[in-house]
């Protein structure tokens, strides 16, 4: 026999979900034990079976979550999972606050991606800081040159996607371009895009040829940095 | 050629509930954002609700938030917006309008295809 | 929210006569990448809204050239440079840069 524990920890680091309006949030406590545990849920510490919820919950006990839909600001609180078992019992919180912000599109930091000069071998890191109420989806697009033009007939231009994922990935907002070549020099653009729209912004990359040694050695001040 | 096509307008009185529902084709439904617009008879354009590409992410007018919920099937290429408590003053047109796709915008990112509508009644 | 004060309520013009509708925002619709997020709509009888301009300025794919939007912020202008017939509807514009998505009250066109 053994009392609760929880089987993923990590999946529970996030306490505070500040969420906005509308959105759905899914709270979840995997756990294991012997004999197998159950798990019931309180709301500020009372048996939570959201029976007074517009839309109402949804518990899903095989996966040790609790789900409600179309969050308004009553669904603020602290939401514990009580998981136990006749050996003993495991608690957690997690906090939740319901935004009421208008939610927009996405916002760039200006002078995000950067122009940026590199040389031939060198790693770049482009970079696009993004502000969004509603979760962004990124995509990182290189602008290409389809037989001789860089533009269709639509007068839209030609990109390339090299990138793309939501927010909450790691490292989603940095575009790292390695031992770069002259065919990676070009115009580079992160597009950030959520439920309200699309917004993006784009950075040049000049990639210059491998400096010369000799001609390095004899003038070391002009060298080329970002 | 891209299409949305609503359905499940009628009448119904105060208090009791409709389900609407859009089905679209001519594009790749589950890459974008969807919206619904309604226009009161005589009225004009009032904005109702959005869900994104992948139905995580809901926002409402004040005027329907709590009595409505939009959704999505993106295997089905349906939207549905369910309307709960209905009141006389959501009498309307209801419009299905395609919003924000993933990619580079070839043109406006959004509410660029409509529609026919489809007419909701709210009567005693 | 942002409201949308649309104006004049209605217009009537005569065939090959420039118009003119005007729009003003409560907040300015210039968004951080530099584009300003104002649509312009029309909509004919018993049909829905059809797209003309998109972001300030851009014809929507088919839109005829005497259409067109200008403006700066909070202050917008659809022009039509010479009305024909096919022209007569409500014209609509909306903000498109935060939700909720907020429309001008409309403006009818009519021919003389």
């Known amino acids: 026999q053994q009392a609760p524990y929880w089987t993923h920890p990590q999946r529970m680091e996030k306490k505070l979900h500040a969420v906005p309006a509308g959105n759905t949030v899914k709270f979840r406590c995997p756990a294991a034990g012997n004999p197998t545990p159950t798990i019931r849920w309180l709301k500020d510490g009372q048996a939570f079976h959201g029976e007074n919820r517009i839309g109402g919950i949804r518990l899903r006990h095989q996966h040790w979550s609790l789900v409600m839909e179309s969050v308004v600001p009553s669904d603020r609180g602290t939401y514990t999972c009580l998981v136990e078992n006749a050996v003993g019992s495991i608690r957690y919180n997690y906090l939740l606050d319901v935004l009421e912000r208008s939610p927009h599109r996405p916002i760039l930091q200006a002078g995000l991606p950067a122009n940026t000069t590199a040389v031939v071998g060198s790693d770049v890191e482009l970079l696009c800081k993004v502000y969004s109420d509603a979760q962004p989806h990124i995509q990182w697009l290189k602008h290409i040159v389809i037989n001789g033009s860089s533009f269709g007939a639509d007068g839209f231009p030609y990109v390339q996607v090299l990138k793309t994922a939501d927010i909450n990935s790691s490292e989603v907002e940095v575009l790292y371009l390695r031992n770069v070549s002259a065919e990676d020099a070009g115009e580079y653009t992160c597009l950030a895009g959520n439920s309200i729209g699309l917004s993006y912004q784009s950075a040049w990359l000049t990639v210059l040829p491998e400096e010369d040694p000799t001609w390095t050695a004899a003038a070391p001040e002009a060298r080329y940095t970002d | 050629e891209v299409q949305l096509l609503e359905s499940g307008g009628g009448v119904v009185q105060p208090g009791r509930s409709l389900r609407l529902s859009c089905a679209a084709s001519?594009?790749?439904?589950?890459?974008?954002?969807m919206h619904w617009v309604r226009q009161a008879p005589g009225k004009g354009l009032e904005w109702v609700a959005v869900i994104s590409y992948d139905g995580s992410n809901k926002y409402y007018a004040d005027s329907v938030k709590g009595r409505f919920t939009i959704s999505r099937d993106n295997s089905k290429n349906t939207l549905s917006l369910q309307m709960n408590s209905l009141r006389v003053e959501d009498t309307a047109i209801y419009y299905c309008v395609r919003g924000a796709g993933q990619g580079y915008p070839y043109g406006p990112d959004g509410f660029d295809i409509w529609g026919q509508g489809t007419m909701v009644t709210v009567s005693s | 929210d942002i409201v949308m004060t649309q104006t004049p309520l209605s217009l009537s013009v005569t065939p090959g006569q420039p118009a003119s509708i005007s729009c003003k925002s409560s907040r300015s619709l210039l968004h951080s990448d530099g584009k300003t997020y104002v649509y312009w709509y029309v909509q004919k009888s018993g049909q829905p809204p059809q797209l003309l301009i998109y972001e300030l300025s851009n014809r929507f794919s088919g839109v005829p050239d005497r259409f067109s939007g200008s403006g700066s912020r909070t202050d917008f202008t659809l022009k039509i440079s010479r009305v024909e017939a096919e022209d007569v509807g409500v014209y609509y514009c909306?903000?498109?840069?935060?939700?909720?998505?907020?429309f001008g009250g409309g403006t009818k066109v009519e021919i003389k």
């Open positions: 909306m903000q498109y840069i935060e939700a909720p998505l907020t």
């Open positions: 001519g594009f790749t439904f589950s890459s974008y954002a």
